[in-house]
């Protein structure tokens, strides 16, 4: 039978409290449950304690009390309680959530980027979020663009959401560059800075370290290194196709080298242990960045014994 949603002691969708206060939040449910917390609330933190107990009539319900001592502005966010996956139930895990604002007059923005702006990758025509969420829902925030320009929320293309920041539904060229969220609290002006950075889809080059046919003895290990070079503001997806792909014979490791001041270098290393005859054939490394696509392949030959 379907479980009733877990119930939180604080009702409604949001709750405002002052920084420095203690947050008490109880979750009551019909099964064992777990907490999901804002990123800045560490489960290992000494400030945080979670106590579990049996509760309800005949102790048949499951209760869990979350206590967060000396709550801070950056603990603002969603606190949710969800059932642990019940194996017999096909239903997605049921949860109850509340957004808690931890208000601090000295810190209107949850995340502050002052000296160095936070980089946000954007794509023209897509939604862009300037994530200057606030610690209290009644803070008035202005969105400014360098130099000396103000972007006005119109409730359609540009929307203000105190839990997210400014949501630009259809980002254009105009939103590329330095954007600043400003808020005045008690006569003090606070700013947090973002740099929207248009991602390109250029793939400069794709190579496999051994492009010539690869000759390998049966039982040996195959290692193929695929390298993709792109401009700095590009991200790629790298995939391999190979003869015994259906049995997931290969293990793939990925890494990115950003030490070069001109380009990003992405590596995808395919490894197959104890090569067999069924592993011979064409190995293809495919690189995709948005609509751009490049691939490179190499043939692998397997031999039973060494030859001269």
């Amino acid at each position: 039978s379907k479980l009733k949603d877990p119930e939180l002691s604080l009702k409604g969708t949001q709750h405002i409290m002052q920084a420095g206060q203690t947050l008490h939040l109880q979750c009551r449910g019909e099964a064992a449950h777990k907490w999901s917390l804002p990123e800045m609330v560490s489960k290992e933190s000494e400030r945080l304690s979670i106590t579990k107990s049996a509760c309800g009539r005949n102790g048949k319900q499951f209760c869990s009390t979350l206590t967060l001592n000396t709550a801070q502005a950056n603990h603002t966010g969603f606190y949710s309680c969800k059932y642990l996956a019940v194996p017999t139930s096909k239903k997605k895990e049921t949860e109850s959530a509340i957004y808690i604002f931890i208000s601090d007059t000295g810190r209107p923005f949850v995340e502050m980027y002052s000296e160095i702006p936070e980089i946000i990758h954007m794509t023209e025509g897509r939604e862009l979020v300037i994530p200057c969420r606030v610690t209290s829902p009644n803070i008035t925030v202005t969105l400014k663009k360098f130099p000396l320009d103000t972007l006005i929320p119109d409730g359609k293309r540009i929307i203000w959401d105190s839990r997210k920041g400014f949501i630009i539904s259809n980002a254009t060229y105009k939103e590329i560059g330095l954007l600043t969220c400003e808020a005045t609290v008690n006569g003090h002006l606070y700013k947090t800075n973002y740099l929207t950075h248009r991602q390109t889809n250029t793939i400069i080059d794709v190579q496999i370290s051994t492009p010539r046919p690869v000759k390998l003895l049966r039982g040996h290990t195959l290692v193929l290194n695929c390298t993709a070079t792109t401009p700095l503001n590009t991200r790629v997806q790298m995939t391999w196709s190979y003869p015994d792909e259906k049995n997931k014979r290969a293990s793939v490791r990925r890494r990115i080298d950003q030490s070069n001041s001109h380009a990003n270098i992405f590596y995808s290393v395919l490894t197959i242990d104890k090569m067999q005859n069924k592993d011979k054939g064409l190995y293809t490394c495919r690189v995709r960045s948005g609509p751009s696509f490049k691939s490179v392949n190499t043939s692998v030959h397997i031999y039973d014994k060494a030859f001269i």
């Epitope: 360098f146 590329i176 330095l178 800075n193 950075h197 700095l232 503001n233 001041s261």
Partner: antibody
Amino acid sequence: QGQMQQSGAELVKPGASVKLSCKPSGFTFSSNYISWLKQKPGQSLEWIAWIYAGTGDASYNQKFTAKAHVTVDTSSSTAYMQLSSLTTEDSAIYYCARHGGDGYWFAYWGQGTLVTVSA
Amino acid sequence: QLVLTQSPAIMSASQGEKVTMTCSASSSVSYMHWYQQKSGTSPKRWIYDTSKLPSGVPARFSGSGSGTSYSLTISSMEAEDAATYYCQQWSSNPPTFGAGTKLELK
């Protein structure tokens, strides 16, 4: 920490042009605003122009619109400023600087390029 | 364009002494930024957004002000503080700098 490496000193004749370069390192080139500034010996600083490396968009101090032209080359991660129709008044140290924070101040400065205009 | 007037033009202070220099704007500005420049070197960012100290700037430095009147203060002068200090605004285009205050060690 960001650094800005500028090209070496230039001795040029009146009426000629010169192209100065500025190569930032230590941060993603294309996500930066770079300004060019002028300082005559023993004097204060004058802002010439800024350019956003991500798009090539630029803005100039009206005083320098006929004098300076700023560009970027993303393939070599280098910013350039071309000064034309040089006169002795253009003799100065020229700095490139990366913008900080909200863009309205200059966080990292190059070592400067001394341009001397002399017949 | 907006004019910034720095005073005094030249000043000297003994080690340990408190130092204050001012920057006056010809019309109201939102923020003032300050740079330190030593002879033969490029300027360094010293104070931004009126009162914020970038990493690496000693805590004896502070900035304050609003509207048309801003100041930079050193709580206790050190020999390494001898330099020229420039104020800068960008509340209106183009950004402008003050003529500088040269601070010498007495």
